[in-house]
């Protein structure tokens, strides 16, 4: 059988290294060798590249080497496949070397900010040594912030043949580390160089970007003062590297600025003790270059009625996210504050909060929350300076079986009945929402019976037992992940009902 006609011929000119063509099929059924006919020097020269020796036979690639690689030039390439049965020739293909030239990557040697020019980095690099001197090179500069996986790109060309070249990358974030990598190609070429080695540079620092501010209102104390836990953090979009030297807080009762009090702190939280009136609170962060814009918060009066607009809320899990969605009766509300913290028996150690704008959903990556922990999630509507009634729900990002089963006891043992009671599993050991409890009981050498009850039931009366019989019993608590048995208890039904018992003592 004749070899297949070579097709899909593809050639690339590795500048000052080789001119390589590949084709299909890559492998023939029978031993096949190839001859690649080239015309070059604009057609005035021709030669052949062969794959006919044992090491390269059946190999659908061939390279022409210097010094017969001329540039600029137009080549024609024809591939002949030969086996024992004959020869098949490809169509002739035409190659303009400028269009298929691949050069070495450039080398970035510095990425620096320029003194006094904000949000800019100057990239300096060396043109690849192996690149045609006179040709215009096109470049792609890729950059990303150091903690991001998402690359951004900018394209530009450089016509000069200066060995040392620069590009000013503007509109960056202040005081942020950027990773840069650069590739290049002759302007007419379809093949890019590889990417240069990555280099890191940091934009200049500026005054802080701004703060997000929130509060937790605690119940009033006996003396009427209200503890308000203020908390703040760098605003979304602030540079990762931004460091504040400190924070200034000032606050006063509404319409009474002459009662202004000020606090300076280096913490990102502060507890205020306010009266029952409405208060205004202001916080700024500062560094050596200046202050951030002011973050403002209104603390409502103790007796103020807050508006309610969230009608329902759902938490659902996707493959790698927890998504909370809510419905609102107030279309004008487009800002929401989401709080989330673990539902533990003690004071929560980690309290998180985040602002949501122009959406009625909030998403968090599952790996930011602990599996087997129950989280309280509350959403507050925010309309200008007013904060409405929160709507709360609970969620687990991953449920497991409870770490312990219910502690159980048998009460009111009768002749044919018994009342079983059990305690709720502590929050820290539930590992999921308790769906139900199942009571397993079995007479000595008898058949096992079970009864499943809702999770809100902590007591159950078993009937139709056999008199004067020993039973073993345990209660299993179940989550979506499965169940865990509590300790096994034993009891024995009475021979006669309890009120006859004292008259029939056995001596």
């Amino acid at each position: 059988v004749l070899p297949a006609k070579p097709e899909n011929i593809s050639c690339i000119f590795y500048y000052e290294e080789n001119f390589t063509c590949t084709w299909s099929p890559e492998k023939e059924a029978s031993y096949t060798w190839y001859k690649v006919k080239r015309t070059y020097s604009y057609g005035y020269k021709s030669d052949i590249c062969s794959t006919d020796n044992s090491t390269r036979g059946n190999h659908a690639s061939c390279s022409f080497l210097p010094p017969t690689i001329t540039n600029p030039d137009n080549y024609t390439i024809q591939v002949e496949a030969q086996n024992a049965d004959g020869i098949m020739k490809s169509d002739i293909t035409y190659w303009n070397l400028d269009a298929i030239m691949k050069i070495e990557p450039p080398e970035i040697f510095s990425v620096k900010s320029v003194l006094g020019i904000k949000r800019m980095l100057q990239i300096k690099w060396i043109r690849p040594v192996l690149a045609p001197h006179s040709s215009t090179l096109k470049y792609t500069l890729r950059f990303r912030t150091i903690n991001s996986a998402y690359w951004m790109e900018v394209n530009f060309t450089k016509e000069d043949i200066d060995r040392d070249e620069t590009y000013n990358l503007t509109e960056l974030q202040a005081f942020t580390e950027y990773v840069m990598t650069l590739r290049c190609a002759p302007a007419e070429s379809m093949f890019w160089s590889g990417w240069s080695q990555e280099k890191v540079g940091t934009t200049e620092e500026e005054a802080p970007y701004g703060l997000d501010l929130w509060r937790v209102l605690k119940p009033a104390m006996v003396d009427g003062r209200r503890p308000v836990q203020l908390m703040w953090k760098k605003a979304t979009g602030a540079p990762v590297l931004e460091k504040a030297l400190g924070y200034n807080i000032w606050y006063f009762p509404e319409n009474n600025t002459n009662l202004t009090e000020t606090v300076n702190t280096t913490n990102q939280t502060h507890e205020l003790y306010l009266g029952g009136k409405t208060y205004w609170v202001y916080v700024v962060s500062y560094n050596s270059l200046g202050e951030s814009p002011v973050a403002t918060l209104r603390i409502p009066a103790l007796n103020e009625k807050t508006f309610q607009c969230i009608e329902a809320m759902q938490a659902c899990l996707t493959q790698d996210q927890l998504v909370v969605e809510w419905q609102s009766s107030a279309p004008e509300v487009d800002t929401w504050m989401v709080e989330w913290f673990p539902d533990v028996d003690s004071e929560p150690s980690s309290f998180s909060w985040e602002s949501v704008s122009q959406a009625r959903n909030w998403t968090i990556q599952k790996d930011e929350l602990k599996p087997l922990w129950c989280y309280n999630i509350s959403v507050y509507p925010v309309l200008r300076d007013r904060v409405g009634q929160p709507y709360s729900t609970q969620a687990y990002v991953q449920e497991g079986i409870p770490s312990a089963g219910p502690v159980t006891q048998a009460d009111s043992i009768g002749v044919k009945t018994v009342t079983i009671t059990w305690k709720e599993i502590p929050k820290s050991k539930r590992n999921g929402f308790i769906k139900n409890y199942t009571i397993f009981y079995q007479a000595e050498d008898g058949k096992e019976f079970s009864k499943t009850v809702n999770s809100n039931i902590l007591q159950y009366r078993l009937e139709s037992l056999t008199r004067r019989t020993s039973y073993s019993l345990q209660v299993m608590a179940s989550t979506n992940a499965g169940g865990t048995n509590g300790t096994k208890i034993n009891f024995k039904t009475l021979s006669i009902s309890h009120h006859h018992h004292h008259h029939h003592h056995h001596h």
Epitope: S41, Y42, G43, Y44, K45, P67, N74, T76, I92
Partner: antibody, heavy 119, light 107 residues
Framework: EVQLQQYGAELGKPGTSVKLSCKVS????????MHWVNQRPGKGLEWIGR????????IYSEKFKSKATLTADTSSNTAYMQLSQLKSDDTAIYFC????????????WGQGVMVTVSS | DIQMTQSPSSMSVSLGDTVTITCRAS??????VNWFQQKPGKSPRRMIY???NLADGVPSRFSGSRSGSDYSLTISSLESEDVADYHC?????????FGAGTKLELK
């Protein structure tokens, strides 16, 4: 305009040698193969061989391997063919030529030089 | 070496005739065949390259074709300036070889 210039006519005695030149103008001979072709009186064309002036690499027709020696001088943009051990049947017109294999451009031929071998 | 057998060796023709000259290759030379025209005392001139392609400046009455190992040059309506010798050349493989030539003569 590309031109291949071959000069005059050569008269050689049997057993001697002649060296023919082909001066190229309008094109760098490093960028072409230089071919040599002869034509005996009243006969057809015969390919003698070719040289790559870049490296002096030559290929000859078996018949002319011990007859012709091809050289090139890139500094003067000239190709040469030396014919040795001349015999009467070496009498012919000798052409130098640039062939274009791809058809991008034309073929170019010298006007030919008549070599006559006679005692 | 590859032989190029050219026929006829000579041909008497009239103006306006359609003339076909053929070269047969002794082995596969693909498309690598050129046709040349040569007038007395002149250098050859390429008319057809790669078996079927018309060289620059050549009148369209000239055409080249290939059928297997047979290569033909056709002049569709002969004019007086076409009276000349014609040669085929294979350049698929070294050594390159010419056909013996065909001489066109007016009747």
């Amino acid at each position: 305009e590309v031109q291949l210039q071959q000069y005059g006519a050569e008269l050689g005695k049997p057993g001697t040698s002649v060296k023919l030149s082909c001066k190229v103008s309008g094109y760098n001979i490093r960028s072409t193969f230089m071919h040599w072709v002869n034509q005996r009186p009243g006969k057809g064309l015969e390919w003698i061989g070719r040289i790559d002036p870049v490296n002096g690499n030559t290929i000859y027709s078996e018949k002319f391997k011990s007859k012709a020696t091809l050289t090139a001088d890139t500094s003067s943009n000239t190709a040469y063919m030396q014919l040795s051990q001349l015999k009467s049947d070496d009498t012919a017109i000798y052409f130098c030529a640039m062939f274009n294999y791809a058809g991008h451009s034309g073929d170019y031929w010298g006007q030919g030089v008549m070599v006559t071998v006679s005692s | 070496d590859i032989q190029m057998t050219q026929s006829p060796s000579s041909m008497s023709v009239s103006l306006g005739d359609t003339v076909t000259i053929t070269c047969r290759a002794s082995q596969d030379v693909g498309i690598y065949v050129n046709w040349f025209q040569q007038k007395p005392g002149k250098s050859p001139r390429r008319m057809i390259y790669r078996a079927t392609n018309l060289a620059d400046g050549v009148p369209s009455r000239f055409s080249g074709s290939r059928s297997g190992s047979d290569y033909s040059l056709t002049i569709s309506s002969l004019e007086s300036e076409d009276v000349a010798d014609y040669h085929c050349l294979q350049y698929d493989e070294y050594p390159y070889t010419f056909g013996a030539g065909t001489k066109l003569e007016l009747k």
